[in-house]
Interface confidence: medium
C-alpha cells in the first residue's frame, strides 16, 4: 500500500515536473512577447507624441492663418469703404469739373480738344494772335502781351511757310493807306525773336523797334521809333482746354 | 537771288512824263508782286503803285489818275508811266519785287532818280 501511494506519488510529481517545465517554457514566452508589447507600446508612444506635437504645429498654423484671413478681410472692408468714398469724391468732382467747364467755355474757343485761344483771339494753326485796339509804345506793348500771357508775336507758326501772308491779311484790318503794328520780329535775316537782352540793348542804344507795316496786300518789317504809339500783335501757343 | 535794275529816272520839267522800267533776273518773275516805293528826303519810303501775280493794282491816293503801272512777264518787266508831273513827286523811286510766299521778303533795286522841277 505503501508502495503504491509513493509510486504514484512520483508519478504524479513527475507529471508536474512536466507541467511545471511546460509552464514555466510558456511564462517565458509570454514575457518575450509582454517585453514586445512594451517596446512596440512605446514606440506607438513616441509616434503619438510625435503627430501630437505635428498636429499643434497644424493648429498654430491654422490659427495663425486664420488670423490673416481676419486682418485681411478685415482691410478689405476697409479698402472697400474708402474706394467707396472716394468713388463718390471723384463723382462728386466730375460734377464740379462739368459745371467749371460749362462756365469756362465762353471764355474759351476751340478748334480741338488740343488747339484753344481765349476768346477774342484769333486762331492760325497753333498759334493764337491778339489784335490790340488801343496803340501803345514798344516797351509797353510787350509787357502789355506779357500781362496777358504772350509775347508780341512773331509769327512763328506761320513763317515762312508759303502763302503766310493771306493768313496776315485776314488777320489784319484791310487799309490802302497803310497798317503798323508792333511786333517781336528782329531785323536779323532770319527774323528770329530777339532776346530780353538783345532787345534792352536795342532799345537802348538806336531807339528803333521793329513793326510789320501793310500797305495795299504787302507786308514789310519796318522799324520805327521805339516809342512811337502803335497798335500791337500779342501771339501764344494755342493750348488744350483746361481738364 | 533776285536782282532788279531801275532805269528811266531824270529831270523833267512840272506836268511832264517820264516812264520807269524795271528789269528782274535771277527768279520766275510771274511768282512776284511788284511795286514801285518812293523816298523823299527826310521822308519815310513809301508805296506809290503795285500790282500784283494776278495783275491786280494799287495807286497810293497821290498818284491816282496820274501814275500806271504795268507788268510784261514775258520781259521780266515792271513799268510806272508817270503823267502830270509835280514838285512833290521828286524822290528816288525804287522798284520792289514781294514774294508772296515769304511776306517779310523784300527785294529791292538801288533806285532812280526822279526830280521835277517847277
Known amino acids: 500500500r505503501y508502495l503504491q501511494v509513493s509510486q504514484q506519488l512520483q508519478q504524479t510529481n513527475r507529471v508536474l515536473e512536466v507541467t511545471n517545465s511546460s509552464l514555466r517554457q510558456q511564462l517565458r514566452l509570454k514575457i518575450t512577447q509582454l517585453g514586445q508589447s512594451a517596446e512596440d507600446l512605446q514606440g506607438s508612444r513616441r509616434e503619438l507624441a510625435q503627430s501630437q506635437e505635428a498636429l499643434q504645429v497644424e493648429q498654430r498654423a491654422h490659427q495663425a492663418a486664420e488670423g490673416q484671413l481676419q486682418a485681411c478681410q478685415a482691410d478689405r472692408q476697409k479698402t472697400k469703404e474708402t474706394l467707396q468714398s472716394e468713388e463718390q469724391q471723384r463723382r462728386a468732382l466730375e460734377q464740379k469739373l462739368s459745371n467749371m467747364e460749362n462756365r469756362l467755355k465762353p471764355f474759351f474757343t476751340c478748334g480741338s480738344a488740343d488747339t484753344c485761344c481765349p476768346s477774342g483771339w484769333i486762331m492760325h494753326q497753333k498759334s493764337c494772335f491778339y489784335i490790340s485796339l488801343t496803340s501803345k509804345n514798344w516797351q509797353e506793348s510787350q509787357k502789355q502781351c506779357e500781362t496777358l500771357s504772350s509775347k508780341l508775336a512773331t509769327f512763328s507758326e506761320i513763317y515762312p511757310q508759303s502763302h503766310s501772308y493771306y493768313f496776315l491779311n485776314s488777320l489784319l484790318p484791310n487799309g490802302g493807306s497803310g497798317n503798323s503794328y508792333w511786333t517781336g520780329l528782329s531785323s536779323n535775316k532770319d527774323w528770329k525773336l530777339t532776346d530780353d537782352t538783345q532787345r534792352t540793348r536795342t532799345y537802348a542804344q538806336s531807339s528803333k523797334c521793329n513793326k510789320v507795316h501793310k500797305t495795299w496786300s504787302w507786308w514789310t518789317l519796318e522799324s520805327e521809333s521805339c516809342r512811337s504809339s502803335l497798335p500791337y500783335i500779342c501771339e501764344m501757343t494755342a493750348f488744350r482746354f483746361p481738364d | 537771288q533776285v536782282q532788279l535794275q531801275e532805269s528811266g529816272g531824270g529831270l523833267v520839267q512840272a506836268g511832264g512824263s517820264l516812264r520807269l522800267s524795271c528789269a528782274a533776273s535771277?527768279?520766275?518773275?510771274?511768282?512776284?508782286?511788284m511795286g514801285w516805293y518812293r523816298q523823299a528826303p527826310g521822308k519815310e519810303r513809301e508805296l506809290v503803285a503795285g500790282?500784283?501775280?494776278?495783275?491786280?493794282?494799287y495807286y497810293a491816293d497821290s498818284v491816282k489818275g496820274r501814275f500806271t503801272i504795268s507788268r510784261d512777264n514775258a520781259k521780266n518787266t515792271v513799268y510806272l508811266q508817270m503823267n502830270s508831273l509835280k514838285p512833290e513827286d521828286t524822290a528816288v523811286y525804287y522798284c520792289?519785287?514781294?514774294?508772296?510766299?515769304?511776306?517779310?521778303?523784300?527785294?529791292w533795286g538801288q533806285g532812280t532818280q526822279v526830280t521835277v522841277s517847277s
Open positions: 520792289a519785287a514781294h514774294d508772296d510766299g515769304d511776306p517779310w521778303h523784300v527785294y
Open positions: 535771277g527768279t520766275i518773275f510771274d511768282w512776284y508782286s
Open positions: 500790282i500784283d501775280t494776278g495783275a491786280n493794282t
